[in-house]
Amino acid sequence: HSDGIFTDSYSRYRKQMAVKKYLAAVLGKRYKQRVKNK
């Protein structure tokens, strides 16, 4: 969804947490893949 109303501080915090979690998952997968490929 677009950001419109999602600018309040709690929604901003949740968005940050979601992005952090997503990046951690992606980087974790990449790391595992690199280890596997070695």
């Epitope: 677009s2 999602f6 309040d8 709690y10 929604s11 915090y13 949740r14 979601a18 992005v19």
Partner: antibody
Framework: EVQLVESGGGLVQPGGSLRLSCAAS????????MSWVRQAPGKGLEWIGI???????WYASWVKGRFTISRDNSKNTLYLQMNSLRAEDTAVYYC?????????????????WGQGTLVTVSS | DIQMTQSPSTLSASVGDRVTITCLAS??????LAWYQQKPGKAPKLLIY???TLASGVPSRFSGSGSGTEFTLTISSLQPDDFATYYC????????????FGGGTKVEIK
């Protein structure tokens, strides 16, 4: 079993204070945003506030500093400190776990609820 | 401040009926809406989130729809276990709000 159990409710005089506890089991409280919601007898659900994993808090506009949400992750327990209690604070108080946030859905929902604890404010 | 208005407040229906409950948001909340079921003396139970996604273990006779400011909860064929009170909740914001919940709809036996 994943559950929340509230305690600490009871009879309190107007102007008095009470601290409610919510013990979490089957999951780590530190990993979740948590909330308190209350329900006056025969009335609807009324949100009180939220504490996030960083211990930042958000409260309903009507709270006006009378209630404070905190947590002790070492005890896996959530708290609600209630001060300057009034007759209209008489209600069942529920703690609730909030949904995880995802990149394309960071809205908040109440996914797990305790059984509630009754607070009666009366002289 | 986002206000949630539910209608009707009470609904009389019979087993097998198709039941629809409406929830209106005072501003655009996109699809950030949940529905809960509550039975007397029990805690609420999450039924639907993200406006239309069924929570785990919820029967398929329940469905949710809508986006923006208007949302509906539909029970396709009312069962005896469905007589309860239903609440909508906006999940879009928590800054300076009075209450993210609607006022509730009691579904009673006709």
């Amino acid at each position: 079993e994943v559950q929340l159990v509230e305690s600490g409710g009871g009879l309190v005089q107007p102007g008095g204070s009470l601290r409610l506890s919510c013990a979490a089991s089957g999951f780590s409280l530190s990993s979740y945003d948590m909330s308190w919601v209350r329900q006056a007898p025969g009335k609807g659900l009324e949100w009180i506030g939220i504490i996030n994993t960083n211990d930042d808090t958000w409260y309903a506009s009507w709270v006006k500093g009378r209630f404070t949400i905190s947590r002790d992750n070492s005890k896996n327990t959530l708290y609600l400190q209630m001060n300057s209690l009034r007759a209209e604070d008489t209600a069942v108080y529920y703690c609730a776990r909030i949904s995880d946030a995802y990149v394309f859905d960071y809205a908040y929902y109440f996914t797990l609820w305790g059984q509630g604890t009754l607070v009666t404010v009366s002289s | 401040d986002i206000q949630m208005t539910q209608s009707p407040s009470t609904l009389s229906a019979s087993v097998g009926d198709r039941v629809t409950i409406t929830c209106l948001a005072s501003q655009n909340i996109y699809n950030s809406l949940a529905w809960y079921q509550q039975k007397p003396g029990k805690a609420p139970k999450l039924l639907i989130y993200r406006a239309s996604t069924l929570a785990s273990g919820v029967p398929s006779r329940f469905s949710g729809s809508g986006s923006g400011t208007e949302f509906t909860l539909t029970i396709s064929s009312l069962q005896p276990d469905d007589f309860a009170t239903y609440y909508c909740q906006q999940g879009a914001g928590a800054d300076n709000i009075g209450n993210p919940f609607g006022g509730g709809t009691k579904v009673e036996i006709k």
